[in-house]
């Protein structure tokens, strides 16, 4: 179904991974497709097999090296191709000259932990994962807190406009269970987008002491 609407989107995690999604309406679920990466100034080529993630979309990760190795720079251009098997031959279905540092999506922050918790406040820290040293401090974060009886979508976003890997949540309710998530985005890149949200960190505020407010 070549005439069905199709789209090919990839992001670079800033180190050694390009994640791609290929979608095509009307394509057969058992179609065998792959992504091929051909850099303009590197000696390596890389291929990954597209695996179904929904009725009409497939995804794969181009693993370029060890997770923390810096495999691409701001001057690299990687020609990407979607190839699908048709009988005995491979057919090119999509092509793109990909500038990695214009299309960034970092890994979700990791190692979330409660540094200190009180009745109305909680200090939380986290770490970024597999982020290029090129960014130096040019990163921003968004955080959200899940309160009882609400959904993540209803949670207000807290914006940290600098590389600050901690937050002090205030005006919390005593003896209450909360969850917390954070995501990161480099300031660089015309098509750069937010990382996935971190795994939620559950915490509970301390109960109010009888007869006094902490």
């Amino acid at each position: 179904a070549v005439n069905g609407t199709s789209q090919f989107t990839c992001f670079y995690n800033s180190r050694a991974n390009i994640s791609c999604v290929w979608s095509q309406d009307g394509a057969l679920q058992d179609t065998s497709c792959q992504v091929h990466a051909w850099p303009d100034r590197r000696r390596w080529n890389q291929t990954c097999e597209l695996l179904p993630v929904s009725q009409a979309s497939w995804a794969c990760n181009l693993i370029l090296g060890a997770p923390d190795s810096q495999k691409l720079t701001t001057v690299d251009i990687v020609t990407l191709r979607v190839l699908c098997r048709e009988g005995v031959r491979w057919r090119v279905m999509a092509i793109q000259d990909f500038k990695p540092f214009e299309n960034l999506r970092l890994m979700a922050p990791i190692s979330l932990q409660v540094v200190h918790v009180e009745t109305h406040r909680c200090n939380i820290s986290w770490e970024i994962s597999q982020a290029s040293h090129y960014f130096e401090r040019h990163l921003e974060f968004e955080a959200r807190t899940l309160s009882p009886g609400h959904t993540w979508e209803e949670a207000p976003l807290l914006t940290l406009k600098q590389k600050q890997e901690w937050i002090c949540l205030e005006t919390l309710t005593p003896d209450t269970q909360y969850e917390f998530q954070v995501r990161v985005k480099p300031l660089q890149g015309e098509f750069t987008t937010w990382s996935p949200w971190s795994q939620p960190l559950a915490f509970r505020t301390k109960p109010a002491a009888l007869g006094k407010d902490t």
Epitope: S6, F8, T9, I77, V82, M93, I95, D97, N103
Partner: nanobody
Framework: EVQLVESGGGLVQAGGSLRLSCAAS????????MGWFRQAPGKEREFVAA????????MYAESVEGRFTISRENAKNMVYLQMNSLKPEDTAIYYC??????????????????WGQGTQATVSS
């Protein structure tokens, strides 16, 4: 915003050649993937060929592979379609298209934001 103007169409005998040109205006041309589509009388518009912005990547419809060649000259804001060994079934209006900025060139019309008015190519038998 990219404006596209095609030229080079005409009447040619089967087995002959034509070279279509697409002149683009707009600052983003040099980093935009480009494609050619065609529409024969009474038929839907179909993909013909596409090229990445550096020219490193190309793809073709099965029906034209080996006969047509897409190329580009970014310094002149031009895209070309060299059509050899033409057949009567290649008769169509040929359209130049610019892919969505920062996005891949695909085989479906929906992946392209900007279109030219088209140029007629007629192949007689």
């Amino acid at each position: 915003e990219v404006q596209l103007v095609e030229s080079g169409g005409g009447l040619v005998q089967a087995g002959g050649s034509l070279r279509l040109s697409c002149a683009a205006s707009g600052r983003t041309f040099s980093t935009t993937e480009m494609g050619w589509f065609r529409q024969a009388p009474g038929k839907e518009r179909e993909f013909v060929a596409a090229i990445t912005w550096t020219g490193r990547g190309t793809m073709y419809a099965e029906s034209v592979e080996g006969r047509f060649t897409i190329s580009r000259e970014n310094a002149k804001n031009m895209v070309y379609l060299q059509m050899n060994s033409l057949k009567p079934e290649d008769t169509a209006i040929y359209y130049c298209a610019a892919a969505r900025r920062g996005r891949a060139a695909v085989r479906s019309e929906g992946g392209y934001d900007f279109w030219g008015q088209g140029t007629q190519a007629t192949v007689s038998s």
